[in-house]
């Protein structure tokens, strides 16, 4: 039997087959965030658990210093959910005082950093105005999409306000990527 | 030609190639829920359509009694959306009465049950406070992520209140998983 | 070495292996929408960027005239996020006037057009009541799931109100699909 037996007719020799279990993959879960300095006008990055509980990295996908490192060029599906929680937003306090209703907001950004390019690239953004009436509120923002990444690219998750991130459970706030 | 011709150099012989069409996959869609008893402090599980309409299970991924059965160990992408709908939440009723604004909430949990472990594992949770001003509200919670599962694991979707689940259309509330 | 060496025992000869990089894939990003006529009772379809910035189509997955064209039968993961933004919804204006609180809503539908049936099939729907108190609001709706598609099927994203779609950034509103 020839090695080509299972290969469809339109597959070229230069497109190598891959064992799926061999592909770079990671699922990271939330940990309590330590307040860190971040540049003004730049959202702070979350750091993550990468080994304990549900979290894992495999097949040369590594996590270091808030970044997922892409070990191999290709198309990746990237996803994250961040659960936010807070007290009554400024919006409703302002409303009671009769001032204009400028809503607060919560934002999640999945960002790519490439050595060959000076500015980070925002891949995905979920942003939501928060103008809650109740005294305590909580809600998730979920993101996920496919992107062509290069070996050496780094991925991180940035949020508008780290103090609002719910870090209590690994199933509420997470970040992952896998090579397709 | 040797069988290894299409195999990248870092692929070991023990990592078998797979035909993608052969992988376990399922997309389940909502049906009207029959009220069932569930343990106090435990969210009820939804049951699903698995063959009619857009729903399907294939390649040994089976659905039975509210559970998706994992037929093969590996990394799976698991997702669900639940659309909730309700009348004005208690929160706004309470607010009008001048009592503290404890918001109601809606929650979806994707849960893994493993025979070898007595307690279910919560893989994913989406939870949101509901403190709506309008008399009727509706909104989806979406979840999706990758997990390493073992043959024999069972997946289910639990919700905080089955009576709030919108079961009217198969595109509004669904649950799926596929081997990567 | 035989070509079957890497094939698991349950894989039949008729299930060809595929190089992953050869699979149809697309990630489309938002552009400013030009108002177009649409049928009464039918949500308008968004059009998309398919080449610039983060957007791409590859391996015979083509974008034309608001549609993604499916070049090959199989199971696809399909996703979209639409970020909506607006001024205070009618709901809160009505509330102040003491009339019943019928909430406005925002809706995203991923629709399949197929030769097999004359009416479009709604694959995924995300719908949310909007009854905001703040004077400006914004929020995303995310959808994603797996579907069995046929060669020649066409996918589009419909929204309840094109004028509310945030087209300012490619990371806020997007649409994609890839063969599993």
């Amino acid at each position: 039997l020839k090695g080509q037996e299972f290969a469809p007719s339109h597959q070229q020799v230069y497109a190598p087959l891959r064992a799926d279990g061999d592909k770079p993959r990671a699922h990271l879960t939330v940990v309590r965030q330590t307040p860190t300095q971040h540049f003004k006008n730049q959202f702070p990055a979350l750091h993550w658990e990468h080994e304990l509980g549900l979290a894992f990295t495999k097949n040369r996908m590594n996590y270091t210093n808030k970044f997922l490192l892409i070990p191999e060029s290709g198309d990746y599906f990237i996803y994250s959910q961040v659960t936010f929680r807070g007290m009554t937003s400024e919006c409703s306090e302002i409303r009671q005082a009769g001032r204009p209703n400028k809503p607060d907001s919560i934002t999640v950004v999945i960002t790519k950093v490439t050595d060959s390019y000076p500015e980070p690239t925002q891949l995905l953004m979920g942003t939501k105005s928060v103008c809650e009436v109740g005294s305590n509120w909580f809600q998730p923002i979920y993101l996920g999409a496919m992107f062509s990444l290069q070996e050496g690219d780094k991925l991180m998750v940035n949020v508008s306000d780290i103090s609002l991130v719910d870090y209590t459970k690994e199933d509420k706030t997470f970040f992952g990527a896998f090579l397709l | 030609l040797k069988g290894q011709e299409f195999a990248p150099s870092h692929q070991q012989v023990y990592a078998p190639l797979r035909a993608d069409g052969d992988k376990p996959r399922a997309h389940l869609t909502v049906v009207r829920q029959t009220p069932t008893q569930h343990f106090k402090n435990q969210f009820p599980a939804l049951h699903w359509e698995h063959e009619l309409g857009l729903a399907f299970t294939k390649n040994r991924m089976n659905y039975t009694n509210k559970f998706l059965l994992i037929p093969e160990s590996g990394d799976y992408f698991i997702y669900s959306q639940v659309t909730f709908r309700g009348m004005t939440s208690e929160c706004s009723e309470i607010r009008q009465a001048g009592r503290p604004n404890k918001p109601d909430s809606i929650t979806v949990v994707i849960t893994k049950v493993t025979d070898s472990y007595p307690e279910p594992t919560q893989l994913l949770m989406g939870t949101k406070s509901v403190c709506e001003v309008g008399s009727n509200w509706f909104q989806p919670i979406y979840l999706g992520a990758m997990f390493s599962l073992q043959e024999g694991d069972k997946l289910m979707v639990n919700v905080s209140d089955i009576s709030l689940v919108d079961y009217t259309k198969e595109d509004k509330t669904f649950f799926g998983a596929f081997l990567l | 070495l035989k070509g079957q060496e890497f094939a698991p025992s349950h894989q039949q000869v008729y299930a060809p292996l595929r190089a992953d990089g050869d699979k149809p894939r697309a990630h489309l990003t938002v552009v400013r929408q030009t108002p177009t006529q649409h049928f009464k009772n039918q949500f308008p379809a968004l059009h998309w960027e398919h080449e610039l910035g983060l957007a791409f189509t590859k391996n015979r997955m083509n974008y034309t005239n608001k549609f993604l064209l499916i070049p090959e039968s199989g199971d696809y993961f399909i996703y979209s996020q639409v970020t909506f933004r607006g001024m205070t919804s009618e709901c809160s204006e009505i509330r102040q006037a003491g009339r019943p609180n019928k909430p406005d809503s925002i809706t995203v539908v991923i629709t399949k057009v197929t030769d097999s049936y004359p009416e479009p099939t709604q694959l995924l729907m995300g719908t949310k009541s909007v009854c905001e108190v703040g004077s400006n609001w914004f929020q995303p709706i995310y959808l994603g799931a797996m579907f069995s598609l046929q060669e020649g099927d066409k996918l589009m994203v419909n929204v309840s109100d094109i004028s509310l779609v945030d087209y300012t950034k490619e990371d806020k509103t997007f649409f994609g699909a890839f063969l599993l």
Partner: antibody, heavy 120, light 111 residues
Framework: EVQLLESGGGLVQPGGSLRLSCAAS????????MSWVRQAPGKGLQWVSV????????YYADSVKGRFTISRDNSKNTLYLQMNSLRAEDTAVYYC?????????????WGQGTLVTVSS | QSVLTQPPSVSGAPGQRVTISCTGS?????????VHWYQQLPGTAPKLLIY???HRPSGVPDRFSGSKSGTSASLAITGLQAEDEADYYC???????????FGTGTKVTVL
């Protein structure tokens, strides 16, 4: 050409049982959901039950739930309806119907029907 | 009992136009489920007449047309002919019943 041919109808006493069959040809039977629809004499159409192509999903009208069982044998291209605890109000012509496009929920082909009479 | 409501009968002279209404609810037609129409000639099995709200299977004359709006639908027959004398049923899916639902049926008489 799609053909559906029902059989098994007849006269049965209240409380009795009957098994209807529907032989299908002209299409890939296992790819389609199938239904039973009935029509009482001089009355309108009433959906009775549906079964998915692979047979794993079944649904019933409330009026027959717990008494009727729909099933199929894809190797024989045959649909069945097992009717137990029959009542006078089950008297009707029973049609087997092929589902059209999935998610559209309609019947594109019907059999000619078989008459079930429940009477003492 | 039927979930979809139709008029019991309509009639018209040959060549005239008649319409049959079909009224549902928020769990069937109003939920977005398509409406389909069947014609049942005396003593025969029903036959699909209109599917997907407004589409005719091959062989159905273009005198028959369907439409849907909100929680209701309608079937129109233009240029009524003697062979159109039959019972007509609308049909949809109902999520609260997890099943198919038919209209009460309308007898069309050609005067």
């Amino acid at each position: 050409e799609v053909q559906l041919l029902e059989s098994g109808g007849g006269l049965v006493q209240p409380g009795g049982s009957l098994r209807l069959s529907c032989a299908a040809s002209g299409f890939t039977f296992s790819n389609y959901a199938m239904s039973w629809v009935r029509q009482a004499p001089g009355k309108g159409l009433q959906w009775v039950s549906v079964i998915s192509g692979r047979g794993g999903s079944t649904y019933y009208a409330d009026s027959v739930k717990g008494r009727f069982t729909i099933s199929r044998d894809n190797s024989k291209n045959t649909l069945y309806l097992q009717m137990n605890s029959l009542r006078a109000e089950d008297t009707a012509v029973y049609y087997c119907a092929k589902d059209g496009y999935s998610s559209a929920w309609y019947f594109d082909y019907w059999g000619q029907g078989t008459l079930v009479t429940v009477s003492s | 009992q039927s979930v979809l409501t139709q008029p019991p009968s309509v009639s018209g002279a040959p060549g005239q136009r008649v319409t049959i209404s079909c009224t549902g609810s928020s769990s069937n037609i109003g939920a977005g489920y398509d409406v389909h129409w069947y014609q049942q000639l005396p003593g025969t099995a029903p036959k699909l007449l209109i599917y997907g709200n407004s589409h005719r299977p091959s062989g159905v004359p273009d005198r028959f047309s369907g439409s849907k709006s909100g929680t209701s639908a309608s079937l129109a027959i233009t240029g009524l002919q003697a062979e159109d004398e039959a019972d007509y049923y609308c049909q949809s899916y109902d999520s609260s019943l997890s099943g198919y639902v038919f209209g009460t049926g309308t007898k069309v008489t050609v005067l």
